[in-house]
Every structure is written in structure tokens, then in C-alpha cells.
């Protein structure tokens, strides 16, 4: 029953239902998930609040919340109302808030929301809803946010938003729309987010954005785009933006000109095969950028004016080379991931002094010069497996006072420089057969897993069997990419961080260090026990 | 406030090319198009062609394709128009203009003749 | 190319007096409802000055007595009391598809 709360106010509180002062002499009002089937008649005047929704009410009389001037918010979602007749929502010259999610209208209830002036959020969500009428918002002047995602759209309403020049936040996520036209928002100049989402868009007009001068965040998502939306140059304002798992194969030169403000970019999901040199340029709020199998690019991008880019990956393309002044474009990088590619040669990376993790596995590297990776005083990774290198300048890491891990496996090295490694926790020499000497284990007093050519050059670090082994110890966030952790995901900007699951396995070993001072591998035993007296 | 600023009259040959400006300010220059229409002597208006400025973005009348190239420079919020192969009949007032609300054109330039004349 | 028709090619009205400006389109220049068709007013010496835009819609800052209707392919400027300031040529224009084009203009004069 009601609140047992002394007062006027309470007495205008519906039985079962839930009421409580709101701070101003008003009153709040719930009733929602009671099974009502119609409206409570002795409601307050003073009501600020009404919660009527997850209730069984699936028809509304013309007038029936009379002279409840001061609401402000009515919840009627989660009912199985069909239709709404004009003037259900007559006398409320105070409502902001209406909810009307989770119905079965078919169309906006056009007559019922006239003259809501007060009206800033409008849910229409989930219900089946395919027709918006051209005039439905017209009296609506001080809407912010209106839902409409989850219906049965298979076009933008037009002209229904040109009424809407207050508009802040908009969702058409999860409709059947497949083409945004010209101008399809083009009076909605105050909107700052815009979700397109989970449709069926595959063409964008030249021009369909243009107007929308404050957009801030532009999703669309899981989409069948073939092109890349040009049509976003217009948005000088777009801090974040998402077009990933759509059908997208190269992205233009200049692709973000218009876009200066950009701070995310998802596009990960498409099957990009081409990106222009100049696409990333002049993003100075761009910290991360990705890039998996795009398999025509041949050439480093050019990232000029994208100076506080903090991660890099560039995966599985067919760069042969990079710049020398790499760095003096990117002096904020931490992450540089160019697994994947055919570098050759490597410029000297010193200026880019944050850098704390390196991946070029799997590339054409022959020779690791004295001043590659100098000065590198952040650096904690570095992995350079599976290249040709032969030859590493002695002195090469002798200037790396935090690196803690370093991969040189599947190599073509025959002699290792331990200058500059004493603080390594990981090493991994694997698959270097001309590397045959033994490594001494005072050499790396912070060692924990180290992975060695042979098991006889186990035994210097005291390994005698194999009594704590986990399989692919190394790094084993490292191949699966932060896109497949997004794929599942419709909502847009979500973060995740690859860097906890490392930190995880860090202090997993540390366990294990514990039980075990060194783990190395392959463990010598019985089958393995001098296998150099036999090599050659 | 809004303003288009044109650079000032031309006189040409037959043949040669003629390149006017057209610099903006008051608003987000990379933000709108910029379109350009001409005006013959006691004639109507006739458009050329539209640029996105800071893109390569760009849409030429037919008639004007072969002939017309648009440009912008974004450091100095200047777009340009440049006529080649000039004719007689190129003589005209070349007006720049934005692309405003729907596409309507806003905001003029004051206008800049070229007179082709041998 | 749309061709765009104006009618008439002159108009003589007396101050105060309604004037009223004719534009059809060669073919409808509608998409989604809205009427891609704009009104300008240029006095000599000047440059076009925007009126209405998408057929019906006012520009900021332009006298009330300026007004637009239509759809489709046929439109009307109407000034609804011609005042001398009003002394101009007046072109109806269409972006509803490449190449953009204009009306030849109504000249409109005191009567």
C-alpha cells in the first residue's frame, strides 16, 4: 500500500503502488510491475513522477492523467499498448521525460505528442514501429534525446526531424534502414550523438551529414557500407567515431581531413585491403590506431599533425621499410606493433623516447645496428622473432634499462650480446640453431622463463627436469587482437586493456618462481641430454 | 560573422587561364562546401561546379569539366577557381559561395569579373 | 539537366500591393519529403542574397513578408507588400541533382 508517511501528498498515492516526496512538495509516484491494466485514477495533482511501466495497460482513454500539471516524467515501456489517441498526454505542460519504450506501436503516436513543449526525452525504442510522420515532432521544440532504435524503420524520417533543431542525442540503432540521403539531418544542428548502428545502410549520400555541425559521436556499426562514409568530412566536431563490421575494403587519402577532433576511430571488422598514406593525417587527439591484414598497403603511413598517437599496430601489410624521421612524427608512442610486415632494415627508433613496447615478429630483418634501439629507456618489450637476423652490434642493448622482456627466437643467430640485459625476466632464444654457446645464468639474475635453442643449455640455469611447465608461456595476449574482444560488442566505445591479462601472467610466473627459480625450455632429461655433441 | 572575400577583376586573352580566389573566415572553413556560379553580362546564374574544402571532394558541371579545376588551401581558408582555354563567352562575374542550410547558398562573395578579350 | 521555369519574366506591382513569382521544375526535385528548391533576390551590382530555403523555409534575418510554397515541380515566391527595398531580380534554383541550376529570374518592379 502507500508510504505510511504522514501528509497531503500522500493521500493521492494509488494502492500497491510506491510513493515518496521528491524534495519540492511534489510527490514520486511508482507503480510499475503491479499487473494494472489501466491507469490508477486517485492520483495527486502533485505528482512530479509516475512510473507505470512493466504493467499489463494496452489501451490509454483520451485525457486520462488529468490536471497532473506538475509531471515531469511518465514511464509507461514495457506495456502492450498498441496506439495512443490524441490527447492522452493532455494538461501535462510540465512533462520532460516520456517512456514509451517496449510497446507494440506501429507508428508515432503523432496527435498524442503534440504541444509537449516541455518534453526533452522521448523513448520510442522497441516497438514496431515503421512509419514516422512528417509533422509528429513539430510542436516538440524542447526535445534533447529521442529513442527510436529497435523498430521497424527502413528509412530515415526526414522530414519529421527538421522540427527538431534542439536535438542533442539521437538513436536509430537496430532499424532496417539502407540508405541515409542528402541532408537526412540536416536542421539537427545542436546533435552531438548520432547512432546508426545495427542497420542495414549500404550507401550514404554525399552529403547525408552535412548540417550536423555539433556531432561529437558518429556509430555505424554492423552496417553493409562497401565504401568508406566520406560523407563524415563535414563533421568538424566528431570526437569519435565507428564504422567497423561493415564491408569497407580501403580507406581514401585524406579520409579524416574534415575531422581534426577525432579521439577514436573503430574500423576494425572490414576487410581493408588498401589504405592511403595520407588517410591519418592531422588527428592530433588520435591516441590509438589499428590496423590488421591490409595486405596492399606497402608504404608507412604518413602521420603528420597525428603526433600524440600512444599505440601503433600494423599488422600484415607489405611494408618493406620505414621512414627514418618515424619517430619525430610520433614522439608519444608507447606501442609500435609492425608484426607481420617485410621491413628489411630498421631506422633508429631513439626519439621515440616512450616507447614500451616493440613488436616486429615475423618480418625481413637481417642486422640490428648500434643505435636501433638506443636510449630507449621505457622500452619493457621487445620481440623480434621469426626475422633473418644475423648480426646484433654488440652494444645494441646496452642502453635499455627497463626492458624486461625480449623474443629473438626462429633467428639466424650464431653469438648473443648480454650487454645491457641483466634486467630481463623473459628471454627467448628458440629456433637460433647456430646459437650453440651457453648462457650464463649470472648474467640475468631477474630471469624467470627463458627458452633456449637446446635443452643442454637449460642446465645453466639449473633445470634439471621439467617439473612446472605451461605451454605457449610467451605472451599469450599477443595473438589474439583487441578486435576480436570487440566483435561480440554493438554498443561502441567500449576499452579494453590487452596490458592486464600480461600483467596477469607476470604475477601467475612469479608464483611460479617462487617453486622454480628459472623456467627454462625444452627441459633436459633422459632423451635430451647432450644433443650439441650430436648437431653438424 | 560569415564573410567570402574575392579576389579583384581580370582581363584575359583567348586561351589563357584565369585563376580567382575566394578566402573565408567567421566560420569552420572545412565544415561546408564552396560553390561556384557565374553571371554573364545582363544574363542569369549558371553553376559551375562545388569543393569540400581540405578534401579532394568535388563536383564540376559538365560543361565546365574539362575546363575548371577547384582548390582549396586550408592554412589560409582560400578556395580557388581556375578557368582554362578562355573564350569570349567566358566573360562573366565568378561568384563563390557556401553551401548553407540544405545546400542553399548562404553566404556570396562581392563577385569577381573576368573580362576575355583579345 | 532539371530546367527551371520561371513566370513571369517581369512583374510590375504597386507599394503595399501582393507580388507573386512563378517557378516549375522540368521534373519533381523532391527527396524524402523535402522540396530541394531555394529562392534568392539580387539587386544590381550585387550579389544573389538566399530568401527561402527548401521551398517554404525562411533565412535568418529576412523580412516576414517573403514567403514560399510548393512541391514537386511547381513553386511560388510571394512578397506579400511589396516595399520599394524589394526592387530586384528574383531566381528560383534547384539542388536536388547535379548540375545545380537556376531560373532566368523575374524582374520586380513598382508599379
Known amino acids: 500500500g502507500s508510504s505510511p508517511r504522514s501528509g497531503v501528498l500522500l493521500r493521492g498515492c494509488p494502492t500497491h503502488c510506491h510513493c515518496e516526496p521528491d524534495g519540492r512538495m511534489l510527490l514520486r509516484v511508482d507503480c510499475s510491475d503491479l499487473g494494472l491494466s489501466e491507469l490508477p485514477s486517485n492520483l495527486s495533482v502533485f505528482t512530479s513522477y509516475l512510473d507505470l511501466s512493466m504493467n499489463n495497460i494496452s489501451q490509454l482513454l483520451p485525457n486520462p492523467l488529468p490536471s497532473l500539471r506538475f509531471l515531469e516524467e511518465l514511464r509507461l515501456a514495457g506495456n502492450a499498448l498498441t496506439y495512443i489517441p490524441k490527447g492522452a498526454f493532455t494538461g501535462l505542460y510540465s512533462l520532460k521525460v516520456l517512456m514509451l519504450q517496449n510497446n507494440q506501436l506501429r507508428h508515432v503516436p503523432t496527435e498524442a505528442l503534440q504541444n509537449l513543449r516541455s518534453l526533452q526525452s522521448l523513448r520510442l525504442d522497441a516497438n514496431h514501429i515503421s512509419y514516422v510522420p512528417p509533422s509528429c515532432f513539430s510542436g516538440l521544440h524542447s526535445l534533447r534525446h529521442l529513442w527510436l532504435d529497435d523498430n521497424a524503420l527502413t528509412e530515415i524520417p526526414v522530414q519529421a526531424f527538421r522540427s527538431l533543431s534542439a536535438l542533442q542525442a539521437m538513436t536509430l540503432a537496430l532499424n532496417k534502414i539502407h540508405h541515409i540521403p542528402d541532408y537526412a539531418f540536416g536542421n539537427l544542428s545542436s546533435l552531438v550523438v548520432l547512432h546508426l548502428h545495427n542497420n542495414r545502410i549500404h550507401s550514404l549520400g554525399k552529403k547525408c551529414f552535412d548540417g550536423l555541425h555539433s556531432l561529437e559521436t558518429l556509430d555505424l556499426n554492423y552496417n553493409n557500407l562497401d565504401e568508406f562514409p566520406t560523407a563524415i568530412r563535414t563533421l568538424s566536431n566528431l570526437k569519435e567515431l565507428g564504422f567497423h563490421s561493415n564491408n569497407i575494403r580501403s580507406i581514401p587519402e585524406k579520409a579524416f581531413v574534415g575531422n581534426p577532433s577525432l579521439i577514436t576511430i573503430h574500423f576494425y571488422d572490414n576487410p581493408i585491403q588498401f589504405v592511403g598514406r595520407s588517410a591519418f593525417q592531422h588527428l592530433p587527439e588520435l591516441r590509438t590506431l589499428t590496423l590488421n591484414g591490409a595486405s596492399q598497403i606497402t608504404e608507412f603511413p604518413d602521420l603528420t599533425g597525428t603526433a600524440n598517437l600512444e599505440s601503433l599496430t600494423l599488422t600484415g601489410a607489405q611494408i618493406s621499410s620505414l621512414p627514418q624521421t618515424v619517430c619525430n612524427q610520433l614522439p608519444n608512442l608507447q606501442v609500435l606493433d609492425l608484426s607481420y610486415n617485410l621491413l628489411e632494415d630498421l631506422p633508429s627508433f631513439s626519439v621515440c623516447q616512450k616507447l614500451q613496447k616493440i613488436d616486429l615478429r615475423h618480418n625481413e630483418i637481417y642486422e640490428i645496428k648500434v643505435d636501433t634501439f638506443q636510449q630507449l629507456l621505457s622500452l619493457r618489450s621487445l620481440n623480434l622473432a621469426w626475422n633473418k637476423i644475423a648480426i646484433i652490434h654488440p652494444n645494441a642493448f646496452s642502453t635499455l634499462p627497463s626492458l624486461i622482456k625480449l623474443d629473438l627466437s626462429s633467428n639466424l643467430l650464431s653469438s648473443f650480446p648480454i650487454t645491457g640485459l641483466h634486467g630481463l625476466t623473459h628471454l627467448k632464444l628458440t629456433g637460433n640453431h647456430a646459437l650453440q654457446s651457453l648462457i650464463s645464468s649470472e648474467n640475468f639474475p631477474e630471469l624467470k622463463v627463458i627458452e633456449m635453442p637446446y635443452a643442454y643449455q637449460c642446465c645453466a640455469f639449473g633445470v634439471c627436469e621439467n617439473a612446472y611447465k605451461i605451454s605457449n608461456q610467451w605472451n599469450k595476449g599477443d595473438n589474439s587482437s583487441m578486435d576480436d574482444l570487440h566483435k561480440k560488442d554493438a554498443g561502441m566505445f567500449q576499452a579494453q586493456d590487452e596490458r592486464d591479462l600480461e600483467d596477469f601472467l607476470l604475477d601467475f610466473e612469479e608464483d611460479l618462481k617462487a617453486l622454480h627459480s628459472v623456467q627454462c625450455s625444452p627441459s633436459p632429461g633422459p632423451f635430451k641430454p647432450c644433443e650439441h655433441l650430436l648437431d653438424g | 560573422e560569415v564573410q567570402l572575400v574575392q579576389s579583384g577583376a581580370e582581363v584575359k586573352k583567348p586561351g589563357a587561364s584565369v585563376k580567382v580566389s575566394c578566402k573565408a573566415s567567421?566560420?569552420?572553413?572545412?565544415?561546408?562546401?564552396i560553390e561556384w556560379v557565374r553571371q554573364a553580362p545582363g544574363q542569369g546564374l549558371e553553376w559551375i561546379g562545388e569543393?569540400?574544402?581540405?578534401?579532394?571532394?568535388?563536383d564540376y558541371n559538365e560543361k565546365f569539366k574539362v575546363r575548371a579545376t577547384f582548390t582549396s588551401d586550408t592554412s589560409t581558408s582560400t578556395v580557388y577557381l581556375e578557368l582554362s582555354s578562355l573564350r569570349s563567352e567566358d566573360t562573366a562575374v565568378y561568384y563563390c559561395a557556401r553551401g548553407g542550410h540544405y545546400g542553399s547558398l548562404d553566404y556570396w562573395g562581392q563577385g569577381t569579373l573576368v573580362t576575355v578579350s583579345s | 539537366d532539371i530546367v527551371m521555369t520561371q513566370s513571369p519574366d517581369s512583374l510590375a506591382v504597386s507599394l503595399g500591393e501582393r507580388a507573386t513569382i512563378n517557378c516549375r521544375a522540368s521534373?519533381?526535385?523532391?527527396?524524402?519529403?523535402?522540396?530541394?528548391m531555394h529562392w534568392y533576390q539580387q539587386k544590381p551590382g550585387q550579389p544573389p542574397k538566399l530568401l527561402i530555403y527548401?521551398?517554404?523555409n525562411l533565412e535568418s534575418g529576412v523580412p516576414d513578408r517573403f514567403s514560399g510554397s510548393g512541391s514537386g515541380t511547381d513553386f511560388t515566391l510571394t512578397i506579400s507588400s511589396l516595399q520599394a527595398e524589394d526592387v530586384a531580380v528574383y531566381y528560383c534554383?534547384?539542388?536536388?541533382?547535379?548540375?545545380?541550376?537556376f531560373g532566368q529570374g523575374t524582374k520586380v518592379e513598382i508599379k
Open positions: 534554383q534547384q539542388n536536388y541533382e547535379d548540375p545545380f541550376t
Open positions: 521534373e519533381s526535385v523532391d527527396n524524402y519529403g523535402n522540396s530541394f
Open positions: 527548401l521551398a517554404s
Open positions: 569543393i569540400l574544402p581540405g578534401s579532394d571532394s568535388t
Open positions: 567567421g566560420y569552420t572553413f572545412s565544415a561546408y562546401w
